[in-house]
C-alpha cells in the first residue's frame, strides 16, 4: 500500500558519536519528500526535518534529553508538492528505524591526548575530557560526566626507538607510568566502555611523542 509515485524509506541507520546523533536512510528522493518522527517507547511522536529532500535528520536535540532512554524513529514519504496525500490506508507511507539507546550504543569519539609531563622516571599523561552535547543546568557535560565509572581509558606507549608496546588503564583521565630515564616515548589512548556489547572502544587517538611541543620534560 502507499501513495502512487512514492517509495518507502529503507536502510534506516543511526549514526551517533559522543551523542551527536543523525538518522540516515535511503533512497535519494525523486519527486518525493520526507518527514521524520522520533519517540521513546512510552512517549508521543515528535516530528523533525519536515518535508525534507535530505536523507538524514539530526536528532541530537531529542536524544540528549535522556540518553538512557530507548528511541524509535520513523521516516514518512510524501509526494513532492502534495504532502497532504496519503496512502490507501489513510496515512502516508513510512518505515521504522531500529531501536536506539544512546547510552549503550553511541560511538565513542576519537580521544585526544591533552598533555604529558615527565618528572624523572615518571610520566603523567592526561586525556582531554571531551565535551558532549548532553546538557545539564545549561552547561554541556563532558564524556566523563555522562559515563562516569563506566568509562575507562587505555594508554598504549612505547619507546620511540622500538616497536614493543606497553599498556596501562585508568578510571580517570590521567595515567602515571614508569619510563626509562633518557628514553623518548610515544603515546596513544583509546576510550573504552567495558560493560558494553557494541561500540565498546573508540578509535585510537593521534600519536604524541616526547620531544614534541605537547609535552613537558623536567629532569629531577
Amino acid at each position: 500500500s502507499g501513495t502512487t509515485n512514492t517509495v518507502a524509506a529503507y536502510n534506516l541507520t543511526w549514526k551517533s558519536t559522543n551523542f551527536k546523533t543523525i538518522l540516515e536512510w535511503e533512497p535519494k528522493p525523486v519527486n518525493q519528500v520526507y518527514t521524520v518522527q522520533i519517540s521513546t517507547k512510552s512517549g508521543d511522536w515528535k516530528s523533525k526535518c519536515f518535508y525534507t529532500t535530505d536523507t538524514e535528520c539530526d536528532l541530537t536535540d531529542e536524544i540528549v534529553k535522556d540518553v538512557k532512554q530507548t528511541y524509535l524513529a520513523r521516516v514518512f514519504s510524501y509526494p513532492a508538492g502534495n504532502v497532504e496525500s496519503t496512502g490507501s490506508a489513510g496515512e502516508p507511507l513510512y518505515e521504522n528505524s531500529p531501536e536506539f539507546t544512546p547510552y549503550l550504543e553511541t560511538n565513542l569519539g576519537q580521544p585526544t591526548i591533552q598533555s604529558f609531563e615527565q618528572v624523572g622516571t615518571k610520566v603523567n599523561v592526561t586525556v582531554e575530557d571531551e565535551r558532549t552535547l548532553v546538557r545539564r543546568n545549561n552547561t554541556f557535560l563532558s564524556l566523563r560526566d555522562v559515563f562516569g565509572k563506566d568509562l575507562i581509558y587505555t594508554l598504549y606507549y612505547w619507546k620511540s626507538s622500538s616497536s614493543g608496546k606497553k599498556t596501562a588503564k585508568t578510571n580517570t583521565n590521567e595515567f602515571l607510568i614508569d619510563v626509562d630515564k633518557g628514553e623518548n616515548y610515544c603515546f596513544s589512548v583509546q576510550a573504552v566502555i567495558p560493560s558494553r556489547t557494541v561500540n565498546r572502544k573508540s578509535t585510537d587517538s593521534p600519536v604524541e611523542c616526547m620531544g614534541q611541543e605537547k609535552g613537558e620534560f623536567r629532569e629531577i
Epitope: 538512557k68 539507546t101 562516569g148 565509572k149 560493560s195
Partner: antibody, heavy 121, light 109 residues
C-alpha cells in the same frame, strides 16, 4: 515513577541456593546498573555486586565471587540474584538499588523494599 | 579491600548544622570515587540522598549538600529537622567495586 519491587522472604536450609528477584518499572531497564546490597541483622551495608541488564555485564565483590550469580530478563524488566551454598552468616536482608541519572550520577538512589533471607537448619 | 570510615554517631540541635564525613583507607577521596550518601529511616527503608559526590536526588531537600573537603567526602545538613534523625551511609567506588562505610547514626536533639 521508578520502582523496584523485590520478591518475598525466604527460609532456606544450609547448603541450599536462593534466587531473589527485583522487578523494575518506570524507566528503561536495560540502561541502568542494578546494585545488590546485603544488610545482616544489626550490621551495616555490604555491596555484593552489580549488573547492567542491557549487556548482562556484571561486577562482583570478591567476597561473594563463586557463590553469587546475577541475571536479568529484559523482557520482564526483572533482575535476579542467586546465592548458593548458603550458610548461617548469609541470613540478612538483601536489597536491589539503582542510581538517579540526570546527565551524570552513579550509585544508590532508588531502593527495593528488601528481601529477608533466613538460613536455618 | 579499602575500608571506608564514618563517625559512628553524631548529634545536632534542631535548626543546627552538622557535617558527616566519609574517609577512605587508601588515601584522599576524589570525584572518581563517586561518593554516595544513603539515608535509612526505620519503617521507611533506604533512600539515596546524594550520588556522584554532589548530585542530589529529586527528593533530596536543599538542606543536604555533598562535597569533597580536603581528603574526605562530606555530607552537610543545614537547619536540621526532627525528621532528619536517621542512619546515614556513604559508599565509595574503587575502580571496579563499591565499599560502604559503617554508617553514622544522626540524632536531632
Amino acid at each position: 515513577e521508578v520502582q523496584l519491587q523485590q520478591s518475598g522472604a525466604e527460609v532456606m536450609k544450609p547448603g541450599a541456593s536462593v534466587k531473589i528477584s527485583c522487578k523494575a518499572s518506570g524507566y528503561t531497564f536495560s540502561s541502568y546498573w542494578i546494585e545488590w546490597v546485603k544488610q545482616a541483622p544489626g550490621q551495616g551495608l555490604e555491596w555484593i555486586g552489580e549488573i547492567l541488564p542491557g549487556s548482562a555485564s556484571t561486577k562482583y565483590n570478591e567476597k561473594f565471587k563463586g557463590r553469587v550469580t546475577f541475571t536479568a530478563d529484559t523482557s520482564t524488566n526483572t533482575a535476579y540474584m542467586e546465592l548458593s551454598s548458603l550458610r548461617s552468616e548469609d541470613t540478612a536482608v538483601y536489597y536491589c538499588a539503582r542510581d538517579y541519572y540526570y546527565g551524570s550520577s552513579y550509585g544508590f538512589a532508588y531502593w527495593g523494599q528488601g528481601t529477608l533471607v533466613t538460613v536455618s537448619s | 579491600q579499602a575500608v571506608v570510615t564514618q563517625e559512628p554517631s553524631l548529634t545536632v540541635s534542631p535548626g543546627g548544622t552538622v557535617t558527616l564525613t566519609c574517609r577512605s583507607s587508601t588515601g584522599a577521596v576524589t570525584t572518581s570515587n563517586y561518593a554516595n550518601w544513603v539515608q535509612e529511616k526505620p519503617g521507611h527503608g533506604f533512600k539515596g540522598l546524594i550520588s556522584g559526590t554532589n548530585n542530589r536526588g529529586p527528593w533530596t531537600t536543599a538542606r543536604f549538600s555533598g562535597s569533597i573537603l580536603g581528603d574526605k567526602a562530606v555530607l552537610t545538613l543545614w537547619g536540621a529537622h526532627a525528621e532528619d534523625e536517621a542512619d546515614y551511609f556513604c559508599a565509595l567506588w574503587y575502580s571496579n567495586h563499591w565499599v560502604f562505610g559503617g554508617g553514622t547514626k544522626l540524632t536531632v536533639l
